[in-house]
């Protein structure tokens, strides 16, 4: 039960007090008590509770004839059981007795008042009123926890407008409306009660600048919405009627949680006496509402597709029809990047990561906008980001980045249980350099600190400054699967590769090309591969750092060697020993559902056959995946790229709630 | 072949800054590793810094780094090096140069470490 | 102070051989083959006439030729020319913190 006030009682005058319904009010009848009385009595009206307790030990008990010892050890409280008609139409009186003289009464007068700032604490979606059952103040994860959501109202329900909703002052439209979480306030007091008495709706200082709040006409259009609070405000003082009266209030996030914010904002409805005009305002009753600002959460891709994204650019008609017929069998929608607008930049999956946000009223996708900022840089805010699709960037939008802040090198495993801790929203999985130099790359700060502070995805940091453009897609993948864990992950393996060739040429295929069917690319025999000494060292460091990954990913996905398939897949050292894929690399594959698009790695024919195709399709095939090997060769393998890096995918979001689970 | 036209050269106060330009025509420079090389008044060669192709990694000698910062726009053909916080030490013509990538060899000859085109330099003079 | 040593100057005369050496470390020369050869004429850019330790460049006469043994490159021009005198800068990939070295220069007086 919240706390009320306290109410110091004296004998020479009646008190005038006002006690809300659901608080704990003290009563102290101690301090004024006439000197020679030693004991007391308390009679109130019916819908009044008094609660004596005297202790140590407590000894509670309510209010009858009893009288008792009047000594600092009595505790006396009072709750209200009903709101009042009129001021102070409830009547306490205390009686004091001593040996030597007649009893002496004080009395209090109460007004009892509802005051109850309600929202959907439960999580249901819906708002109830919560008066005396939870406390409000507190936020729990977990499926019994408790605490309201806010959304960072982080799209653009105006076509009109360039800029995000949160971004301007205005309420568009009841779709802008949705976005944002109801509060109430709840008001039940006599019909002069606020002659006296003012409410203050406030903010902390330190968290004004991540929500607004709109108060909104009740029954009229959501055009009467005006703001109260926000980065500009920090309180604001409420006209209320007396009488019964519920006010409702629309509460948007600003800002997404991050290093220096936790996500937590702190709604309080403040009661002011205003009674004496040559006083400041009193303070008599404080209910406050907490809300979590929800996080931003990827998607795996074991999570259904729903839309793919690619570009077009110069001669890439067929690898967009590939494209276009996978994401037909997938059933999603398809979203072409016209060379108008991509500038000749392909890299889709670079240039953005898509997620979601959820509260228990609404689910946005969100597109996480990378700071790479090269020719796709207006598409995610230009053509992604819209009604009911939100927008949020991080890190310098001018200079100061390296490769690794590409998204191609953001990804996030599907759920994973690790020695008993459950991540049921998956982990996000990055790249980095193993350690610290001069010229060792890094994701920038900004973004490593963003994704961390969402906290249900916790981050693991993976070793990919091993690799010329440094990216973990050009090493990882996840695919879904009907058994274990509902999923593999993927893995380059040269190892693989070269078992492979040893097997085909044991079987007298030495002589099979690699690269036959490619135009003015010089083609090699798999004994040539097999035996190119300086080749062999390349991929056994790549091995190296490949495994360095496996045991890592081993350890913080809690997988056993069962969950991982090794794809076969040869690179070579490039300039300042970076690391490239020798030929198309396959682990570097669209995954739509059970639909894979795999760049095709123009291996040895044999028999009529890719064995490099046939090896892949082995492996996947029994997993119910079906494999499409795209001819990527020329408009992104060349570019230090392949189908993933070239196209991007937006997931269901997880049927799982973020606030069931517990970081 | 490629060729290159390096512009942005001038005077500038120690501590200033300077932004020079590679400019690329006769092929596309995305095909190309790319470095910038300078010379001293008078003195040889001192290798400065390097970009891929893919504008995914960079390097830099231990007497620019910190300071200078190389990029790239491949869209526009051009390379560029933003040069912050410049000392009179820093005075020299600079060339931008480029090798391309030979994808067609097995194992890569190490193109990047050595510079077949170069332009014809931009002097930078750092002097109060 | 450049990394890699070289001869401030050599001479001779047309018709004869020259070999410039460049002297590294194990950290550099000596531990890989990219060695590249550059020839310098006054007011001029660089021109790249070996790589790899001995490879030339399409272009460049067979006169240039280059070669490696432990830490030190070198550059030989036989049947010396008037228009080969230049300057000669020889220039390595190096596992220290500054991943590209040149030497120090060699002025090639042809007599």
């Known amino acids: 039960m919240a706390q009320g006030t306290l109410i110091r009682v004296t004998p020479e005058q009646p008190t005038h007090a006002v006690c809300v319904l659901g608080t704990l009010t003290q009563l102290d009848i101690c301090s004024s008590a006439p000197e020679d009385c030693t004991s007391f009595s308390i009679n109130a009206s019916p819908g009044v509770v008094v609660d004596i307790a005297h202790g140590p030990p407590a000894k509670k008990k309510s209010t009858g004839s009893s009288t008792w010892p009047l000594d600092p050890g009595v505790e006396v409280t009072l709750t209200m059981k009903v709101a009042s008609g009129s001021t102070g139409d409830q009547k306490v009186q205390i009686s004091y007795y001593g040996p030597k003289t007649p009893p002496v009464k004080a009395l209090l007068y109460l007004t009892g008042v509802e005051i109850s700032l309600c929202a959907d604490i439960t999580r249901t979606g819906k708002v109830k009123p919560t008066r005396a059952v939870k406390d409000q103040r507190t936020w729990t994860w977990g499926p019994c926890g408790q605490g309201a959501i806010l959304l960072v109202n982080c799209d653009r329900d105006n076509l009109e407008s360039s800029a995000m909703d949160c971004e301007d002052d205005e309420v568009l439209d009841s779709e802008d409306l949705q976005d944002m979480s109801l509060m109430t306030l709840s008001t039940k007091t006599p019909k002069d009660f606020f002659t006296n008495h003012t409410l203050v709706l406030h903010v902390a200082r330190s968290e004004m600048d991540k929500v607004r709040v709109f108060q909104a006409t009740r029954g009229k259009l959501s055009s009467k919405c005006s703001v109260v609070l926000g980065p500009k405000w920090p309180s604001h003082y409420l006209m209320v009627p007396g009488g019964k009266h519920n006010m409702d209030f629309y509460v948007e996030a600003l800002a997404f949680p991050d290093t220096d914010f936790p996500g937590l904002i702190t709604l309080t409805i403040s009661l002011l006496d205003t009674s004496n005009l040559e006083l400041p305002e009193a303070v008599v009753f404080q209910d406050s509402v907490v809300f979590r600002v929800a996080p931003w959460i990827m998607t795996p891709n074991t999570q259904p597709p729903q839309e793919v994204y690619a570009c077009s650019i110069f001669e890439n008609e067929d690898f967009l029809k590939s494209v276009t017929t996978l994401a037909m069998k997938a059933k999603c929608k398809l979203t072409i990047c016209p060379e108008e607008e991509n500038m000749d930049d392909q890299w889709m999956q670079d240039e953005m990561e898509i997620g979601y946000i959820q509260a228990p009223h609404k689910t946005l996708p969100v597109v996480f906008d990378s700071p790479r900022n090269r020719g796709l840089k207006e598409f995610p805010i230009k053509r992604v980001m819209g009604p009911d699709f939100g927008y949020v960037t991080r890190g310098p939008q001018t200079g100061g980045i390296s490769g690794l802040d590409s998204f191609g090198n953001l990804e996030v495993s599907p759920p994973v249980t690790v020695r008993g801790k459950e991540y049921p929203l998956g982990r996000i999985l990055f790249g980095d350099s193993c350690y610290p130099s001069n010229d060792s790359r890094q994701m920038h700060q900004a973004l490593q600190d963003f994704l961390s502070a969402q906290q249900v995805q916790a981050p693991v940091k993976l070793y990919s400054d091993w690799l010329s453009v440094g990216h973990v897609d050009e090493f990882l993948s996840f695919v879904p699967a009907p058994d274990r864990k509902g999923f593999r992950l993927l893995l380059a393996s040269p190892r693989s590769c070269y078992k492979l060739f040893q097997e085909q040429q044991n079987e007298g295929h030495g002589e099979a090309l690699l690269f036959e069917g490619i135009k003015k690319k010089k083609q090699q025999k798999i004994k040539n591969i097999l035996s190119n000494k300086t080749l062999r060292e390349h991929n056994s460091f790549v091995e190296r750092c490949i495994d360095w990954n496996r045991e890592l990913l081993k350890r913080e996905l809690g997988l056993a060697e069962s969950d991982i398939i090794d794809i076969p897949q040869l690179f070579k050292l490039k300039e300042f020993s970076k690391a490239e894929a020798f030929f198309p690399n396959m682990v570097n594959m669209l995954v739509l559902g059970k639909h894979l698009g795999i760049p095709k790695p123009f291996g040895p024919v044999i028999n009529g056959r890719c064995c490099l195709e046939e090896k892949v399709c082995s492996l996947l095939e029994p997993l119910g995946l079906q494999c499409t090997f795209i001819n990527d060769f020329f408009t992104y393998h060349i570019r230090h790229g392949e189908v993933h890096c070239g196209t991007n995918v937006r997931r269901k979001p997880f049927s799982f709630k973020w606030w069931n689970m517990v970081p | 072949q490629v060729q290159l036209v390096e512009s942005g050269g001038g005077l500038v106060k120690p501590g200033g800054s300077l932004r020079l330009s590679c400019a690329a025509s006769?092929?596309?420079?995305?095909?190309?590793?790319v470095s910038w090389i300078r010379q001293a008044p008078g003195k040889g060669l001192e290798w400065v810094s390097f970009?891929?192709?893919?504008?995914?990694?960079?390097y830099y000698a231990d007497s620019v780094r910190g300071r200078f910062t190389i990029s790239r726009d491949n869209a526009k053909n051009s390379v560029y090096l933003q040069m912050n916080s410049l000392r009179a030490e820093d005075t020299a013509v600079y060339y931008c140069?480029?090798?391309?990538?030979?994808?067609?060899?097995?194992?890569?000859?190490?193109?990047?470490?050595?510079?077949?085109?170069w332009g014809r330099g931009t002097l930078v003079t750092v002097s109060s | 102070q450049s990394a890699l040593t070289q001869p401030r100057s050599v001479s001779g005369s047309p018709g004869q051989s020259v070999t410039i050496s460049c002297t590294g470390t194990s950290g550099d020369v000596g531990r890989y083959s990219h060695v590249s050869w550059y020839q310098q004429h006054p007011g001029k850019a660089p021109k790249l006439i070996i790589y790899n330790v001995y490879e030339r460049p399409s272009g460049v006469p067979d006169r240039f030729s280059g070669s490696k043994s432990g830490n030190t490159a070198s550059l030989t021009i036989s049947g010396l020319q008037a228009e080969d005198e230049a300057d000669y800068y020889c220039s390595s990939h190096s596992r220290s913190s500054t991943p590209v070295l040149f030497g120090g220069g060699t002025k090639l007086t042809v007599l």
């Open positions: 970009i891929n192709q893919a504008n995914t990694f960079t």
């Open positions: 006769g092929s596309t420079l995305s095909d190309y590793f």
């Open positions: 140069s480029s090798a391309n990538d030979d994808v067609d060899d097995i194992v890569a000859p190490g193109r990047g470490y050595y510079m077949d085109v």
